[in-house]
């Protein structure tokens, strides 16, 4: 694999207003405290830390219809988009540490500014494809994909804070893995737009090996292109990542999470990564928090080359230099 | 299956000096206390108990370079080799209850004295293939395979206590299953020697059914031969075998462990078995200890014919004799 | 899928005398309390509640040989058979909430009165195929299949309470999934009669996708016919359904349980369903009880169309009517 696959720009995105639970803004902090950067460097990654984005508080951010905190969410993603684009222009893989999943609007938009041909793999229990009109919760972390899809352009009203957004991916450019809690409106969109998805049903039917084979063939079969992996830790089973906002039983195993990310690494095409929705406030015990964080760290390390079969540098270990 | 597949010689190997944690020498005791012998007899096995080997304390066993307790480890395996060879000459399947995995040097060496054409299946989170020169820990339970492989003959220095060892298997005679924590030097050896392995990545990709099909075809496809299964309980996920010295998350499930052993039994070729690294002192609670021990017992019973689909003797259960 | 697949008649069967543990008679109550009916209605099911069957106490119900409570068990199943037949004549899918698995004698008998060509999928850790003569426990919840099979007609003695029973299915009409604790006599019957089964060994070998493909092809390949799913919650791993009478480690996962039921729903042929052996008295903690009940509810909802990929009604969610 080229060194490019291990050249990273880390962006902390301590933001929580796309959903109602406090604590997810601490995600970047706990991931850093768990030694993420040190571990990446240990596995021969070239890591540049772009720090945590300073998200200013926006007063009077009243709802748009039932959509909550629209200006805060829109502005946060706008900031993030700029920073991700900067990282990409610097030739690094962007690693966004969330924060809630509404930030994917910014992360993918920024990525697409530099690599408009990117393909997205979205690992999540949820499709996050509600529009501001189909949402029943009003939480924007359940809506990012609707803002990003060209096919939904006419279906997104003018939400304050989002005027900067231009849809940048087509329905054929995204693959979902791990779905198991999908709203009726979201399901309608999924089927109507013919989006490729592997819900937990397909994962059970095919096995994760075939799922990844089909995913990568679907996105890369015709032409190699940059991959953006947006990983919500709730895609994994709550037994592995309990400290998250919307856990759903019956998720991907720790092993399946690692397999997905190992396979993506092996393409050599990973170009942007989001690690989202770690919320240390939602662990019932300190152990639940560390379990969640350690799992998120392991997933990240696999994205950047750590392999369960082992790794070695190109030297002769049996005849070390005198 | 012939009665030979259920004719067993049990050897307790209460030894712990291949690693730093006290308690693994109690492995044979807790496995016996859990009723292992009684359960084997209940499933129609012909069990001969050769007792626990008496490992004398060796004073002044100073390190060789960084390799710890070399004389103790070497002597223990030498004793075990003799006892395993005796069991094999008696026409029994050797069942070694460890004790730490350094003992596999003795178990496989003794087995190979009587069956030099044996093939090895090594179930473990680790390759245990460090040489005394590549090891960073100095613990010999991480090195047994390096002593056994003919291809590494020139790479093993003269470690005190090991002058009796003659490498007895080729790189093509071993298959690993369950790997997920492999040192760089070990990975180098794995790839350089072209050793067949199924890390957890391959298990996830292929499923355990295909893994076992490929394993048995690889070892037995050209010619039937005796199988030595060396089973480190850390090959299984720590949720099933927590009371062990080097647990690694993301391991084989209880079900996968049973599948591996059921399939090996069904070949009719199991000739030697090691059940290693049960350490009752490392259970956080007594329940963790019994969970580990019960799992190890279940794995062992499957090696000797206990099947999840059920078993019956060759009698008519619907028309029992009057 | 036609509306028929979501037209349900619910029968509570609060009965426990097919086994020794009190509490399983509370199964219908806890399943109802968990909101099962409301949830079914929420997913567009047409639900008719036939209430709980009133099982009168039968005095002097002395054992037949070692078979316990024969008159009580026989009478309960006789009552249930009548009620299931009524539900089927009303054009509804019968949903029996157990209660212990001896009730399947009644549930399947009643179903077969109206649909004599039915095929049975039996999800269970156990075959429940002991005859009154092969049983060692005497508990009738381990015997229902022996009463139902035509091939065993001559092997079933005249047990008081069962004179009404006529075997209604052939050995070729049933498929087992999840087996892992099978008595020798039961195994003999399984093999002698050539019954199709997927023990946990086969599930591990093939994966649940292939298991369901083969199951449905076996039962429906030549001719479409009604399916009766008899689901013992002990078929699932005790980590998901601990509050049950005879838990056995190494069971089907929550995901596999959902996959089985989703696939059965998708045939459009589900005609009868039993949800059996939920015993709230056997949860070690309140959480164990709710975990069991929630799992049983999820399994049931999947039988009637709830899909992990999502569901939507045939309306346009993006252009809702003004």
């Amino acid at each position: 694999m080229s060194a490019k696959s291990r050249t990273i720009g880390i962006i902390g995105a301590p933001f929580s207003k796309g959903q109602p639970r406090g604590g997810v803004e601490e995600g970047p902090t706990v991931l850093r405290k768990a030694g993420l950067l040190e571990k990446l460097k240990e596995q021969e990654c070239d890591v540049k830390d772009y720090g945590d984005l300073p998200f200013a508080d926006i007063p009077n951010d009243s709802p748009f219809q039932i959509v909550k905190n629209p200006r805060s969410v829109g502005k946060a993603s706008e900031q993030l988009a700029g920073k991700v684009a900067e990282v990409k222009k610097n030739g690094r893989i962007s690693l966004v540490l969330g924060g809630d999943h509404s930030l994917a609007i910014g992360s993918i938009s920024g990525h697409a500014r530099v690599h408009p041909d990117l393909g997205v793999i979205w690992v999540d229990a949820h499709t996050d494809i509600n529009t501001p009109l189909t949402t029943t919760s009003g939480n924007l972390h359940g809506q990012p994909v609707s803002f990003l899809l060209k096919e939904l352009k006419g279906k997104i009203p003018d939400v304050p804070g989002f005027s900067w957004v231009t849809p940048c991916i087509s329905a054929k450019d995204i693959v979902y893995i791990g779905l198991r809690d999908v709203d009726p409106g979201e399901h309608y969109i999924l089927k109507t737009l013919g989006i490729k998805y592997f819900s937990m049903t397909e994962v059970d039917r095919l096995g994760i090996g075939k799922v990844m084979e089909e995913t990568l063939s679907y996105l890369l079969g015709r032409k190699k292109r940059p991959i953006h992996l947006s990983f919500d830790v709730d895609g994994l089973d709550p037994s592995f990542t309990p400290a998250t906002g919307t856990p759903v039983v019956g998720g991907l195993t720790y092993r399946e999470g690692l397999y997905i990310t190992e396979e993506i690494y092996k393409t050599g095409l990973l170009s942007g990564l989001d690690i989202m929705e770690v919320n240390p406030s939602l662990g019932k015990t300190p152990e639940e928090v560390t379990r969640t964080v350690n799992t998120a760290v392991a997933i990240t390390l696999a994205c950047f080359g750590l392999a369960r079969e082992g790794n070695h540098k190109p030297i002769d270990y049996l005849n070390p230099p005198k | 299956m012939s009665a030979k597949s259920r004719t067993i010689g049990i050897i307790g190997a209460p030894f712990s000096k291949g690693q730093p944690r006290g308690g693994v020498e109690e492995g044979p005791t807790v496995l016996r206390k859990a009723g292992l012998l009684e359960k084997l007899k209940e499933q129609e096995c012909d069990v001969k108990d050769y007792g626990d080997l008496p490992f004398a304390d060796i004073p002044n066993d100073s390190p060789f370079q960084i390799v710890k307790n070399p004389r103790s480890v070497g002597k223990a395996s030498e004793q075990l080799a003799g006892k395993v060879a005796e069991v094999k000459k008696n026409g029994r399947i050797s069942l070694v209850l460890g004790g730490d995995h350094s003992l596999a040097i003795g178990s496989i060496s003794g087995h190979a004295r009587v069956h030099p054409d044996l093939g090895v299946i090594w179930v473990d989170a680790h390759t245990d293939i460090n040489t005394p020169l590549t090891t960073t820990s100095g613990n010999l339970h991480g090195q047994p395979v390096s002593f056994l492989l003919k291809e590494l003959k020139g790479k093993i220095p003269d470690v005190p206590g090991f002058s009796w060892v003659t490498p007895c298997i080729s790189a093509k005679d071993i298959v690993y299953i369950g790997l997920r924590d492999v040192d760089p030097g070990e990975h180098y050896i794995l790839k350089t020697l072209g050793i067949k392995y199924f890390s957890m990545t391959e298990v996830d990709r292929l499923g355990i059914g295909k893994v076992m099909e490929e394993t048995l075809s690889y070892l037995l496809g050209r010619k039937k031969r005796p199988i030595h299964l060396s089973f480190d309980v850390d090959g299984l996920d720590p949720s099933f075998t927590p009371a062990t010295g080097t647990p690694v998350v993301g391991g084989l499930t209880y079900r996968e462990g049973l599948y591996i052993t059921e399939e090996i039994y069904k070949t009719g070729l199991l000739s030697g078995l090691d059940i290693m690294e049960v350490n009752p002192s490392l259970g956080k609670t007594p329940e963790e200890v019994t969970r580990t021990v019960n799992t190890a017992v279940a794995i062992t019973l499957a090696c000797f014919g206990l099947a999840r689909e059920g078993n019956h003797k060759p009698i008519d259960y619907l028309n029992p004799p009057k | 899928m036609s509306a028929k697949s979501r037209t349900i008649g619910i029968i509570g069967a609060p009965f426990s005398k097919g086994q020794p543990r009190g509490g399983v008679e509370e199964g219908p109550t806890v399943l109802r309390k968990a909101g099962l009916l409301e949830k079914l209605k929420e997913q567009e099911c047409d639900v008719k509640d036939y209430g709980d069957l009133p099982f009168a106490d039968i005095p002097n119900d002395s054992p037949f040989q070692i078979v316990k409570n024969p008159r009580s068990v026989g009478k309960a199943s006789e009552q249930l058979a009548g009620k299931v037949a009524e539900v089927k004549k009303n054009g509804r899918i019968s949903l029996v909430l157990g209660g212990d698995h001896s009730l399947a004698i009644g549930s399947i008998s009643g179903h077969a009165r109206v649909h004599p060509d039915l095929g049975v999928i039996w999800v269970d850790a156990h075959t429940d195929i002991n005859t009154p003569l092969t049983t060692t426990s005497g508990n009738l919840h381990g015997q229902p299949v022996s009463f139902l099979l035509k091939e065993l007609k001559g092997k079933i003695p005249d047990v008081p309470g069962f004179s009404w029973v006529t075997p209604c299915i052939s050995a070729k009409d049933i498929v087992y999934i999840g087996l892992r604790d099978v008595d020798p006599g039961e195994h003999y019957i399984l093999k002698t009669l050539g019954i199709k089964y997927f023990s946990m060994t086969e599930v591990d070998r093939l994966g649940i996708g292939k298991v369901m493909e083969e199951t449905l092809s076996y039962l429906l390949g030549r001719k479409k016919r009604p399916i009766h799913l008899s689901f013992d919650v002990d078929g699932l791993d005790p980590s998901f359904t601990p509050a049950t009478g005879t838990p056995v480690v190494g069971g089907l996962t929550y995901r596999e349980g959902l996959y089985i039921t989703e696939e059965i729903y998708k045939t459009g042929l589900l005609s009868g369903l039993d949800i059996m052996e939920v015993n709230p008295s056997l949860g070690k903690t309140p959480e164990e009880v709710t975990r069991t009940v929630n799992t049983a509810v999820a399994i049931t909802l999947a039988c009637f169309g709830l899909a992990r990929e999502g569901n939507h009604k045939p309306i346009d969610y993006l252009n809702p009517p003004k």
Epitope: - | K33, E42, S281, P286, E287, E288, T290 | T246
Partner: antibody
Framework: EVQLQQSGPVLVKPGASVKMSCKAS????????MNWVKQSHGRSLEWIGV????????TYNQKFKGKATLTVDKSSSTAYMELNSLTSEDSAVYYC?????????WGQGTTLTVSS | NIVLTQSPATLSVTPGDSVSLSCRAS??????LHWYQQKSHESPRLLIK???QSISGIPSRFSGSGSGTDFTLSINSVETEDFGMYFC?????????FGGGTKLEIK
């Protein structure tokens, strides 16, 4: 021969707590697990819980969680059980017993009487 | 919890008789069943482990059998010192549980 010597009989008032001991000798204390068993009015036996003297890890019968607390003092090879919020239902003989699967060695028992 | 049911509750015999005591488990427990004897004002003592395995120091007239759910303790030619309570205990799962006991008394 393994010896498990238990503390003497106790009479306490309802609502009080009591701590009984079990001193082990003639074997390595940390090598075996110590269980506690309750016997009410000379008949039924109930397993309370078990402790690992090696690391203090415990597994309890859910029924006795909150009622019994098991501890050990490695230095004196002694196991302890504390029972709290005592009622007449807790009046019984309590045995310390070793090991993990079957119980080969039993203490002589401590009689607890709870009475006002 | 696994329930162990012992029968009969009381057994009256004459020295020299042979007797069988039953212990039935509420679910299959393989051979994870052990038998104890308790004489009046004494602690229980282990007689049989794993359904049928004898314990050193225990007279050979005591034997055990069974597997799964049904277990039997047999005493071949009862002696006067054998009178007392007999308990079975399972080690198949937590919590460990005992049967209610069978009282062996002189007829």
């Amino acid at each position: 021969e393994v010896q498990l010597q238990q503390s003497g009989p106790v009479l306490v008032k309802p609502g009080a707590s009591v701590k009984m001991s079990c001193k082990a000798s003639e074997y390595t204390f940390t090598d075996y697990y110590m269980n506690w068993v309750k016997q009410s009015h000379g008949r039924s036996l109930e397993w309370i819980g078990v402790i690992s003297p090696y690391n203090g890890g415990t597994t309890y019968n859910q029924k006795f969680k909150g009622k019994a607390t098991l501890t050990v003092d490695k230095s004196s090879s002694t196991a302890y059980m504390e029972l709290n919020s005592l009622t007449s239902e807790d009046s019984a003989v309590y045995y310390c017993v070793y090991d993990l699967y079957y119980f080969d060695y039993w203490g002589q028992g401590t009689t607890l009487t709870v009475s006002s | 919890n696994i329930v162990l049911t012992q029968s009969p509750a009381t057994l009256s015999v004459t020295p020299g008789d042979s007797v069988s005591l039953s212990c039935r488990a509420s679910q299959r427990i393989s051979n994870d069943l052990h038998w104890y004897q308790q004489k009046s004002h004494e602690s229980p003592r282990l007689l049989i482990k794993y359904a049928s395995q004898s314990i050193s120091g225990i007279p050979s007239r005591f034997s055990g059998s069974g597997s799964g759910t049904d277990f039997t303790l047999s005493i071949n030619s009862v002696e006067t010192e054998d009178f007392g309570m007999y308990f079975c205990q399972q080690s198949n799962s937590w919590p460990r549980t005992f049967g209610g006991g069978t009282k062996l008394e002189i007829k």
